[in-house]
Interface confidence: low
Amino acid sequence: SAPGEDEECGRVRDFVAKLANNTHQHVFDDLRGSVSLSWVGDSTGVILVLTTFHVPLVIMTFGQSKLYRSEDYGKNFKDITDLINNTFIRTEFGMAIGPENSGKVVLTAEVSGGSRGGRIFRSSDFAKNFVQTDLPFHPLTQMMYSPQNSDYLLALSTENGLWVSKNFGGKWEEIHKAVCLAKWGSDNTIFFTTYANGSCKADLGALELWRTSDLGKSFKTIGVKIYSFGLGGRFLFASVMADKDTTRRIHVSTDQGDTWSMAQLPSVGQEQFYSILAANDDMVFMHVDEPGDTGFGTIFTSDDRGIVYSKSLDRHLYTTTGGETDFTNVTSLRGVYITSVLSEDNSIQTMITFDQGGRWTHLRKPENSECDATAKNKNECSLHIHASYSISQKLNVPMAPLSEPNAVGIVIAHGSVGDAISVMVPDVYISDDGGYSWTKMLEGPHYYTILDSGGIIVAIEHSSRPINVIKFSTDEGQCWQTYTFTRDPIYFTGLASEPGARSMNISIWGFTESFLTSQWVSYTIDFKDILERNCEEKDYTIWLAHSTDPEDYEDGCILGYKEQFLRLRKSSVCQNGRDYVVTKQPSICLCSLEDFLCDFGYYRPENDSKCVEQPELKGHDLEFCLYGREEHLTTNGYRKIPGDKCQGGVNPVREVKDLKKKCTSNFLSPEKQNSKSN
């Protein structure tokens, strides 16, 4: 029987009455156009909703927008359009919400063609009040807040100027011209690329990378011949043109660009690309595109300096056309990532790693599912997950996989069970152990969200017809109740809950359509009365993460340590609460070969924990370039996985010797460079 329909499912008592008392409808006095919603701050309950409507006239398009504010998680909204002088707000810039709980909001207004500059509306009190500010430039991008100081903003102008404000957008200063891309780094540092000869496009590969650590008072040129740059974790990456041809190489810095080393990654040609898939302070996942329009490439994982890389996964799906990849960080369990590979027969298969890219496997077949028509063997197949690529291909997949750090072990995703991803209508699957095992949770495509740190899962069927029913589960998707939230069905457009999955409120957005008009409408449902009591100690149970063999002393060891979590029992119907903190107990493991990646020049054959020398490098000295000096690597093929905390046990020898010989990448010996200060 389908999940939720067997006899064992305990009903939540009187839930209809409890939810009916906590369902709040708001009809927006708007013609349907587009709607965007932003949460302002954390646990503040403040939501801003911007609706825009374009009326196409014969010669021009007339736009109208309205701004609404809620301070009770969406139960009630107030029209605050007058606070922004009834100005039309440009939706392509969105609402720029400040970091942390700064309460800052910037809205960018549409201005008439001949104006000297743009116009913004600024609020620093969670959108209670706004100040209108006319800009000395026309913005090209949304205002970007410094992560360290929300008073510091940067923006690019339509004329490629880099503008900075030190007083939250009150006063602006152009600190540099001819800027292509700008990003905040740490310590209020700004990194940006500049062109010399005409345009960003024309100078691609001949850009200069600049840094200012004092908001534009002075600059340092930290790289030339730049194609692009990126920041990830504590790493700064630049892809740099080679001197003699049109290839590019990645260079990496861990000190904000003062010193650079060439990453031991393949160079790429004009049609290829690099992509940082994920990065933290320990390491980086880097995708390197294959030559030709193959739609795939190779994932490499870095050492702790971002310099030496190990091949992690071949034939990794990453389309050049739409730039789509299914690479997903499973945030509910440490070390887990899911992605797709393009197999030799051009079918797409899902792979999962539990040890930060050390080894990849297929997803285990859900026990309550049958293999579909893609399976050659009806008894042996895997679960394949639909993510960004499927969504881009317009498959019937309304949502990407979902996981939350505070809902430990829970992963929800659309998928199909077979030898590869199927184009048939997918079902929704859930894992409660970070991706090791899976269960079919809901039949057919759904929108879903996690509330109360996993205490409640909410879902709405994906349908082209109007809907009026929401489903919810209090036991991690085993059993489902349905609740009719309105008599009159609405055309559903989205589910909204406060980021962080701590809230117990869910907002259902949609529009009503009648003969004369259509209007935006939202229903906010508060589940607090379903989870009547606060969870107590007895409601939690100890769970060992990454456990695959309880008999093994090293069971659960991943990246050198194991973690025991206190997790809510599925049978407990109670509130984790907004202040819930994940309780975990780590313990260090002995080192095994699993705690080491294969070093530069080595690889790990499939289903083998030993690293063997790459045939093409056998007998060659392993030398690589570090900070412009040639280094000699003495290794027996292993290096500790970044972030691995194991102690004792296996200890492969690894030594790096400075050969005292100069080696330069072209990055450190470019042809020309300018440097200047304000």
Epitope: S186, N188, T212, D258, N674, K676
Partner: antibody, heavy 117, light 108 residues
Framework: EVQLVESGGGLVQPGGSLRLSCAAS????????MSWVRQAPGKGLEWVAT????????YYPDILKGRFTISRDNAKNSLYLQMNSLRAEDTAVYYC??????????WGQGTLVTVSS | DIQMTQSPSSLSASVGDRVTITCRVS??????LAWYQQKPGKSPKLLVY???NIADGVPSRFSGSGSGTDYTLTISSLQPEDFATYYC??????????FGQGTKLEIK
């Protein structure tokens, strides 16, 4: 007006330790990198250490690594240099300097460190 | 490490003279060079940054030029207060950000 005032210098025996301080005023301290530079009697300038604006990144010449530690307290607008295992050749006037990127634009008046038995 | 060679190490000149001090670097530093002036018993003062930019409050008779590995500080018309020691310093790439050994400018 930008001001940098060093203190903490003095006479110390070889092998001893000393902590220099630099009090900054007249500018927004927490957005600037800061450096220490020294000058032995009758000799040229020698770069000693640099610290980034938030204190995340520190730099030293190889010969001083391990003995000298640069740090800062942005709440107090102060820069420090902890010097351990001092040698006679560390005798110098030590300057603190504001270091915005491509230059050291303001310097303190210096504090004399004498290492002698 | 990048080596800085400043020349001359000392120089005698008269008030009104045009004076040039050069700094040669062991590798291309892409204009990441500063010049400082130091008078006896005083702390150094920034004159030029990024090879060619004059610091605030510095008289216009001082100018910086150069690129690649060769850089020059020029004083167009020497004044009595210009007699001092001058240092160059690079800020390219890898620390250490070395100073030149200095040029002592004396009255003839």
């Amino acid at each position: 007006e930008v001001q940098l005032v060093e203190s903490g210098g003095g006479l110390v025996q070889p092998g001893g330790s000393l902590r220099l301080s630099c009090a900054a005023s007249g500018f927004t301290f927490n957005i600037y990198g800061m450096s220490w530079v020294r000058q032995a009697p009758g000799k040229g300038l020698e770069w000693v250490a640099t610290i980034s604006s938030g204190g995340i990144y520190t730099y030293y010449p190889d010969i001083l690594k391990g003995r000298f530690t640069i740090s800062r307290d942005n709440a107090k607008n102060s820069l420090y240099l902890q010097m351990n295992s001092l040698r006679a050749e560390d005798t110098a006037v030590y300057y603190c300097a504001r270091h915005p990127g491509g230059a050291m634009d303001y310097w303190g008046q210096g504090t004399l460190v004498t290492v002698s038995s | 490490d990048i080596q800085m060679t400043q020349s001359p190490s000392s120089l005698s000149a008269s008030v009104g003279d045009r004076v040039t001090i050069t700094c040669r670097v062991s590798e291309n530093i892409y204009s990441n060079l500063a010049w400082y002036q130091q008078k006896p018993g005083k702390s150094p003062k920034l004159l030029v940054y990024a090879a060619t930019n004059i610091a605030d409050g510095v008289p216009s008779r001082f100018s910086g030029s150069g690129s690649g590995t060769d850089y020059t500080l020029t004083i167009s018309s020497l004044q009595p207060e210009d007699f001092a020691t001058y240092y160059c310093q690079h800020f390219w790439g890898t620390p250490p950000w070395t100073f030149g050994q200095g040029t002592k400018l004396e009255i003839k």
